[in-house]
Interface confidence: low
């Protein structure tokens, strides 16, 4: 079927459309082109013989129409007037005519809109404006943006006048924005300038900064305010109700108690002829004195005296802070506040009560803090220490003590040997000892200030010859793969070898076995039951030697998987069942049965005589040993035979 | 028709107490071991530990011995089991179950108590 | 504790089909292997008792076998309702203990 396809459809003022055939007929004699929807020779456009390829002119051609051999027709430099219908008339050689019609619309170019408004300066919550988008133009769509977005739903806000017309009804200030409209049609799309729209609004109520409302006497006054207006506002300054400049910030030096007072802020806008004003009072203190500790007692004794310390001066309605050791004060039954905080009383003082201790005085403004106090609080002596630790020593040797007791003041230190003063010094020594300086040695620590005396006595053994030792244990019963046992030779003596048997063997190389302590220490980690042996110290010198007596190391091991005898599986009816249950376990392990998951006896040896089929069924041994905690079991299924079977025996 | 039915649900926060309960029908209640087992979200299932009901002996878990006491009630036919000391990982599905073939077979179980620990 | 080791630990498959699940045990348990089924309700049963025992009322799809420290549940032809999750447990030794479970899922 022959078609008419117009390329544009929409066609711009100025432009070009191309009236494009389709399906156009074989054996052709010509054709002609009519403006309209009908073949009517008066508007007749063009007509063409395909024999001559002769284009002959109608009464409806502009001069701007150009006809293809294909039939198609161009029409250039379109007008307004040439939107419409056209109809193509074909006429085939056999004279049969066929006809088609197109169409096309033609639009004008749209020029740049502008935006009027009808008040350019709207107050807020007062005004509404009205912008409508300029020129006026038939057939084109209007469209609104706002901050390049398309407008909010609001319902202040308001389209008119086929959308040309944008109204803001109860203007605010988030209004203030960047309006801008679109004019659209078929063939072209323009987009205004950006008109802002200035919202006159304010003043808010000022805000005066800083916020505190605090000063001591001396300081520097600066305030500042400012209140969100349009345009911006003016200020004035009112203090106590007097005027004082028109500035947005006022500056007082060197302030007194008497510029105490209500500060006012008042903020004006012209254009919206509004006045807004904040008060804040303003409060001058005098500096207040710097706080400072007395205490009723200076040289405490430990666990005997109080000591009160007072925070001074007193002032009234103040509130006094305390500090220890740069903390507050910790929660403690020895520490005690007066009901007002001034004195904090440290009853029965340890030496760990030295502090530094402050108190502080809070004002309005900060917190005033006095100097550190340092408690000298007298203790000891404690008893004193002796070193070195030594208890035998060869003859011909020096013989060097240390005594030391923490003690404040430091103790003062006496030597007795076997009960004799020998000197008041904190070190004895004594060259080239002999068997005669054998004896009890006694450190006496003396405090002066608080009259306590402590002693410690060590004796002194001086022989070519050593003793025999002896080996002390740190655990008697250890238990197996959990804990370790360390082995200690007594006594310590000087310049002495240490040595160690196991079943009278030396040292076995192990990952487990540890030396320390000069060899005097032999530590076994994780026990094993083999680890049960007899174990001997030894201690020699250049002179002598000798051997402890073993000491056996009992371990607490098991109870193992135990094993059911005898290995039996299947028995005749009538046969006594007698089960022995053996578990390796150090103690003895305890015993007991299950037939069936139903307890039995607590015995090693489950009897039961003349079986049946009923006995049929899973025979559980139970083992538990106290001492380690531990618990272990074994099953066995036992199958009973109807006597006249003979079934074969299974283990 | 043996039944195991046990108590609801529980919330309880760390460091509390929690007793669920296990009451037992269908069967000579005295004459069968009941067990105790718990199932973490996700997770397997963990022996807790058993209690014959005729003279009230027990065995635990190890590791729930400090955690867990399980008692019986043989006038209502009831098992209960005591955790304390309750922490987050605690939480879990406790679930009761007969033993009823020796050798701890687990022939009927009860359908399960769901116990959230959390602050 | 007697470790056990379950594999695999989850499985997809189709009705009709056979499927076999282990359990390797860390030490012999004689036979005291244990077979149990749970639904995602939570509901728990048990299966196969002391190996090969076939709880009465179980289905004959469903089968135990093994010794010594290495066990098998086997379902000769996997029904709808068999879609759930296996356990298999000891009981030789104290404590009772559980292998980790085999999800069977639907293909």
């Known amino acids: 079927k022959l078609t008419i396809e117009s390329t544009p459809f929409n066609v711009a003022e100025g432009k070009e459309v191309l009236l494009l055939v389709h399906n156009l007929p074989q054996h052709l004699f010509g054709y002609s082109w009519y403006k309209g929807e009908r073949v009517d020779g008066n508007r007749q456009i063009i007509g063409y013989v395909i024999g001559t390829q002769q284009a002959t002119p109608g009464p409806a051609y502009s001069g701007r129409e150009i006809i293809y051999p294909n039939a198609s027709l161009l029409i250039q430099n379109i007008i307004q007037n040439d939107t419409g219908f056209y109809t193509l008339h074909v006429i085939k050689s056999d004279l049969v005519n066929e006809e088609a019609t197109g169409q096309f619309r033609v639009y004008p170019e749209l020029p740049k809109p502008s935006i009027s408004s009808n008040n350019s300066k709207p107050v807020e919550d007062k005004d509404a404006v009205a912008f409508t988008c300029e020129p006026e133009t038939q057939d084109a769509t209007y469209l609104w943006w706002v901050n390049n977005q398309s407008l909010p739903v609001s319902p202040r806000l308001q389209l008119s006048n086929g959308n040309r017309t944008l109204t803001l009804f109860n203007v605010t200030r988030n209004d203030t924005a960047s309006y801008k409209c679109e004019t659209q049609n078929p063939v072209s799309a323009r987009r205004s300038d950006s008109v802002i729209l200035n919202v006159l609004y304010g003043p808010d109520a000022p805000t005066i900064s800083p916020l505190n409302t605090s000063y001591r006497s001396g300081e520097n006054l600066n305030l500042s305010c400012h209140a969100a207006s349009n345009p911006p506002a003016q200020y004035s300054w009112f203090v106590n109700g007097t005027f004082q400049q028109s500035t947005q910030e006022l500056f007082i030096p060197n302030i007194t108690v008497n510029n105490s007072g209500s500060y006012t802020c008042q903020a004006h806008n012209s254009d919206t002829g509004l006045n807004r004003t904040t008060v804040t009072t303003i409060t001058v203190y005098a500096e207040p004195p710097k706080p400072f500790i007395t205490s009723n007692n200076s040289n405490p004794v430990e666990d005997e005296d109080a000591v009160a310390l007072t925070c001074e001066p007193e002032i009234q309605n103040t509130t006094y802070l305390w500090w220890v050791n740069n903390q507050s004060l910790p929660v403690s039954p020895r520490l005690q506040l007066s009901n007002d905080n001034r004195t904090l009383t440290l009853l029965s003082v340890t030496r760990n009560d030295v502090g530094p201790y402050e108190c502080g005085i809070q004002n309005e403004l900060s917190v005033d803090h006095s100097d550190p106090v340092i408690l000298n609080v007298l203790y000891g002596p404690d008893d004193p220490t002796i070193s070195p630790s030594y208890t035998y020593y060869r003859p011909g040797v020096n013989l060097s003590l240390s005594c030391h007791a923490a003690s404040n003041p430091p103790a003062q230190y006496s030597w007795l040997i076997d009960g004799n003063i020998q000197q008041h010094t904190q070190e004895l020594f004594i060259s080239n000892i002999t068997e005669k300086n054998s004896g009890l040695y006694t450190c006496q620590a003396n405090n002066s200030a608080s009259g306590h005396s402590r002693t410690t006595v060590k004796t002194i053994t001086v022989s070519a010859e050593l003793p025999k030792p002896s080996i002390s244990s740190n655990n008697s019963k250890p238990v197996e793969d959990k804990d370790a046992v360390a082995f200690t030779c007594e006594p310590e003596a000087q310049n002495t070898t240490y040595l160690w048997w196991v079943n009278g063997q030396s040292l076995p190389v192990s990952p487990r076995l540890q030396l320390s302590n000069g060899n005097r220490t032999l530590t076994l980690f994780n026990v094993t039951r083999n680890d049960a042996r007899a174990y001997v110290c030894g201690i020699q010198n250049s002179v002598s030697a000798n051997r402890s007596d073993p000491v056996t190391l009992d371990v607490l091991y098991g109870p193992d998987t135990p094993i059911i005898s005898p290995p039996d599986s299947s028995y005749l009816s009538g046969a006594n069942l007698n089960l022995s249950c053996h578990s390796a376990s150090n103690p003895s392990p305890q015993y007991s049965w299950r037939i069936n998951g139903i307890p039995q006896q607590h015995t090693q040896v489950l009897f039961i005589a003349k079986i049946t089929p009923n006995n049929n069924g899973t025979y559980a041994c139970f083992v538990s040993n106290l001492a380690t905690g531990r618990n272990n079991s074994i099953v066995k299924s036992i199958t009973v035979s109807a006597s006249g079977t003979s079934p074969g025996l299974s283990a | 028709e043996v039944q195991l039915v046990q108590s609801g649900a529980e919330v309880k926060k760390p460091g509390a107490s929690v007793k669920v309960s296990c009451k037992a029908s269908g069967y000579t209640f005295t004459d069968f071991y009941m067990n105790w087992v718990r199932q973490a979200p996700g997770q397997g299932l963990e022996w807790i530990g058993d209690?014959?009901?005729?003279?009230?002996?027990?065995d635990y878990n190890r590791k729930f011995k400090d955690k867990a006491t399980l008692t019986v009630d043989k006038s209502t036919s009831t098992v209960y089991m005591e955790f304390r000391s309750l922490r987050s990982e605690d939480t879990a599905v406790y679930y009761c179950a007969r033993s009823g073939y020796g050798n701890y077979v687990f022939d009927y179980w009860g359908q399960g108590t769901l116990v959230t620990v959390s602050s | 504790d007697v470790q056990m080791t379950q594999s695999p630990s989850s499985l997809s498959a189709s009705v009709g089909d056979r499927v076999t699940i282990t359990c390797r045990t860390s030490q012999d348990i004689n036979i005291y292997l244990n077979w149990y089924q749970q639904k995602p309700g939570g509901a728990v049963k048990l299966l196969i008792y002391?190996?090969?025992g076939l709880l009465s009322g179980v289905p004959s799809r469903f089968s135990g076998s093994g010794s010594g420290t290495d066990y098998t549940l086997t379902i000769s032809s996997l029904q709808p309702e068999d879609f759930a999750t296996y356990y298999c447990q000891q009981g030789n030794t104290l404590p009772p203990t559980f292998g980790g479970g085999t999800k069977v899922e639907i293909k």
């Open positions: 209690i014959f009901p005729k003279n009230g002996n027990t």
């Open positions: 002391y190996r090969s």
